[in-house]
Interface confidence: low
């Protein structure tokens, strides 16, 4: 229904706390360089204005769209051009072009320092002094670094953060209580960020239809007892929610997500038997819980997929009459039977099925032509299964750090032109798939591995788009989203690459490395490994292992030495010489 004042409607639906949080996230995601104080001031002004409109919906400007109101606020920020350059040109446009322009200027890799967690005592002090400001800082810092973070989900993580601090700051040993818990939230939030970015990429590059197909597959796997009409309704609603969030309409997105959660909880009987636990929770926890609820038990009496989609004499007629509906039912039926497949794989199979019908239904004898389609799925299914087996075996043999290094070597060989920091980030993220997925039961491994890898590779593509340097990467990134992972897996050593000259300074280290946290030490070593591969792209695994073992031994020796600086300055050059010899 239409409301006289959109801002008043959203304020009333969401409540002041969530309203303010979402407006803060929206501003932080659009203007990523502004300080917390600058954004907090804008948020307060918008909130005060919203309250005016709640009191009187016909007050001045209350009838304006949220884009107009928020955009006008952003365009009035002092020194917009000095700080944001051509983003200021967006302000010359009228809505809806202005908002589109803001979206195009979102930076997936802003040059902001890493979000450092303060020391436990300091954190607890500032949390106790002003929990609202503390949480505001958290929302601001995450949102500006992740401009497509799913806003209602970020409110959920802030709530988690709040609960952890409330609990741990009351304990004697705050540090040992906070660290593992906050590390857990951070890891989950980072995964949530790349997954959501993938959804927005799907929406931006391929439109709502592509996203809806993803949603149908995912929902059919989770709710195999729901009928096709129910799945379609949920997929349509979920598509709307994600479209809004990806489009910067965060108030609408959060409001519609709450509505969807409400609908699911009121219709459990026709959706799934596994929802009750989620539905007993408060709003943010409820929606989060529903988004990762376990799969319902599959119906025992499902007929073979071939009956309706291969053996039925009306296949081509049904397809011609309503292509999208017919393909949608195929995707639904196949997905509900295969919770053990990744969504990417299910979409590849649906695409293969569609291509087969397009070709066969135009021939003289269609059934003879499409009769073998299910058999033709086999190689498409085997490829990711082999990928999972090979990679999980390697992970079990090498552990997370060693597995990351193996991937780093592989990907540096595939795309040596890509910057070393991007390769290291990608390899570290891709390598985490082992810890995340390889320990799961067999039937959960494939969906976990492939859908996670696809999300990480989407980030690789986004970073590469900004400064394209590798034809290999461009080729894989310009295809469809579901083909990207197989494309990257199939890449081999880039034969066109001219190896980098050996520069001793790239492999020169100083005693300050000894005091770095373990993660930073690993990144330094992995940076050196990528540079080695760029120098010798065809180095064997044994050669690289020799060099890396030598390097690790050198660090260990010098970091234990009484005079570290002397050790580094005398042993360092020897190490460089040995490296060159080993790779010669």
């Amino acid at each position: 229904e239409a409301h006289k004042s959109e801002i008043a409607h959203r304020y009333n639906d969401l409540g002041e706390q969530h309203f303010k949080g979402l407006v803060l996230i929206a501003f932080s995601q659009y203007l990523q360089k502004c300080s917390y104080d600058e954004h907090a001031k804008l948020v307060q002004e918008v909130t005060d204005f919203a309250k005016t409109c709640v009191a009187d919906e016909s007050a001045a400007n209350c009838d304006k769209s949220l884009h107009t109101l928020f955009g006008d606020k952003l365009c009035a920020i002092p020194n917009l051009r000095e700080n944001y350059g051509e983003l200021a040109d967006c302000c010359t446009k009228q809505e809806p072009e202005r908002n589109e322009c803001f979206l195009q200027h979102k930076d997936d890799n802003p040059s902001l320092p890493p979000f450092e967690r303060p020391e436990a005592e300091a954190m607890c002090t500032s949390f106790k002094e002003n929990p609202t400001t503390f949480m505001g800082h958290y929302l601001h810092e995450v949102a500006r670094r992740h401009p497509y973070f799913y806003a209602p989900e970020l409110l959920y993580y802030a709530e988690q953060y709040n609960e952890i601090l409330t609990q741990c700051c009351a304990e004697a040993d705050k540090e040992s209580c906070l660290t593992p818990k906050l590390d857990g939230v951070k890891e989950k939030a980072l995964v949530s960020s790349v997954r959501q970015r993938m959804k927005c990429s799907s929406m931006q590059k391929f439109g709502e239809r592509a996203f809806k197909a993803w949603a149908v597959a995912r929902l059919s796997q989770t709710f195999p007892n729901a009928d096709f009409a129910e799945i379609t309704k949920l997929a349509t609603d979920l598509t709307k929610v994600n479209k809004e969030c990806c489009h910067g309409d965060l108030l609408e997105c959060a409001d519609d997500r709450a509505e969807l959660a409400k609908y699911m909880c009121e219709n459990q009987a026709t959706i799934s038997s596994k929802l009750q636990t989620c539905c007993d929770k408060p709003l943010l926890k409820k929606a989060h819980c529903l988004s990762e609820v376990e799969h319902d038990t599959m119906p025992a009496d499902l007929p073979a997929i071939a009956a309706d989609f291969v053996e039925d004499q009306e296949v081509c007629k049904n397809y011609a009459e309503a292509k999208d509906v017919f393909l949608g039912t195929f995707l639904y039926e196949y997905s509900r039977r295969h919770p053990d497949y990744s969504v990417s794989l299910l979409l590849r199979l649906a695409k293969k099925y569609e291509a087969t019908l397009e070709k066969c239904c135009a021939e003289a004898n269609p059934p003879a032509c499409y009769g073998t389609v299910l058999a033709e799925f086999q190689p498409l299914v085997e490829e990711p299964k082999n990928l999972v087996k090979t990679n999980c075996d390697l992970y079990e043999k090498l552990g997370e750090y060693g597995f990351q290094n193996a991937i780093l070597v592989r990907y540096t060989q595939k795309a040596p032109q890509v910057s070393t920091p991007t390769l290291v980030e990608a390899a570290r993220n891709l390598g985490r798939v082992g810890t995340k997925c390889c320990t799961l039961p067999e039937d959960q491994r494939l969906p976990c591995v492939e859908d996670y890898l696809s999300a990480i590779l989407n980030r690789v593509c986004l970073l590469h788009e900004k400064t394209p340097v590798s034809e290999h990467v461009t080729k894989c990134c310009s295809g469809s989203l579901v083909e990207r992972r197989p494309c990257f897996s199939a890449l081999t050593v880039d034969e066109t690459y001219v190896p980098k000259e050996f520069k001793a300074e790239t492999f020169t280290f100083h005693s300050d490395i000894c005091t770095l946290p373990e993660k930073e030490k690993q990144i330094k070593k992995q940076t050196a490994l990528a540079e080695l591969v760029k120098h010798k792209p065809k180095a064997t695994a044994e050669q690289l292992k020799t060099v890396m073992d030598d390097f690790a031994q050198f660090l260990d020796t010098c970091c234990k030495a009484a005079d570290k600086d002397t050790c580094f300055s005398t042993e360092g050059p020897n190490l460089v010489t040995r490296c060159k010899d080993a790779l010669a």
Epitope: A60, K64, D72, C75, P78, L80, E82, A88, C91, T92
Partner: nanobody, 115 residues
């Protein structure tokens, strides 16, 4: 090159009124924002009022109901009518105009509210 000149500042008693004017000259086309900002001694510059391309106005909470911003497109002028002035309004007031070419500021005009 764009030049902005503010005028209308001065000394006024609490409760009094002033009207600030800002005149823009030079190649000023595609204006999307005109605003008044102020900076009190030792404080950061802050937005007082702004008016956008479609005539929407925005005001700082501290001046709502007392100040009115308006513009005359044909003359490239922006005005700030200030009523019920308070000592806290004492500051240098700057005019800001933004167009495709950039963000342009005037030299400022001093407003002092004192008895």
């Amino acid at each position: 090159q764009v030049q902005l000149v503010e005028s209308g500042g001065g000394l006024v008693q609490p409760g009094g009124s002033l009207r600030l004017s800002c005149s823009a000259s030079g190649s000023i086309w595609g204006i999307y924002h005109m605003g008044w900002y102020r900076q009190a001694p030792g404080k950061q510059r802050e937005l007082v009022a702004s008016i956008t391309v479609d005539g929407s106005t925005h005001y700082a909470d501290t001046v709502k109901g007392r100040f009115t911003i308006s513009r005359d497109n044909s003359k490239n002028m922006v005005y700030l009518q200030m009523n019920s002035l308070e000592p806290e309004d004492t500051a240098v007031y700057y005019c800001d105009i933004r167009n495709v070419g950039g963000d342009y500021w005037g030299q400022g005009t001093q407003v002092t509210v004192s008895s």
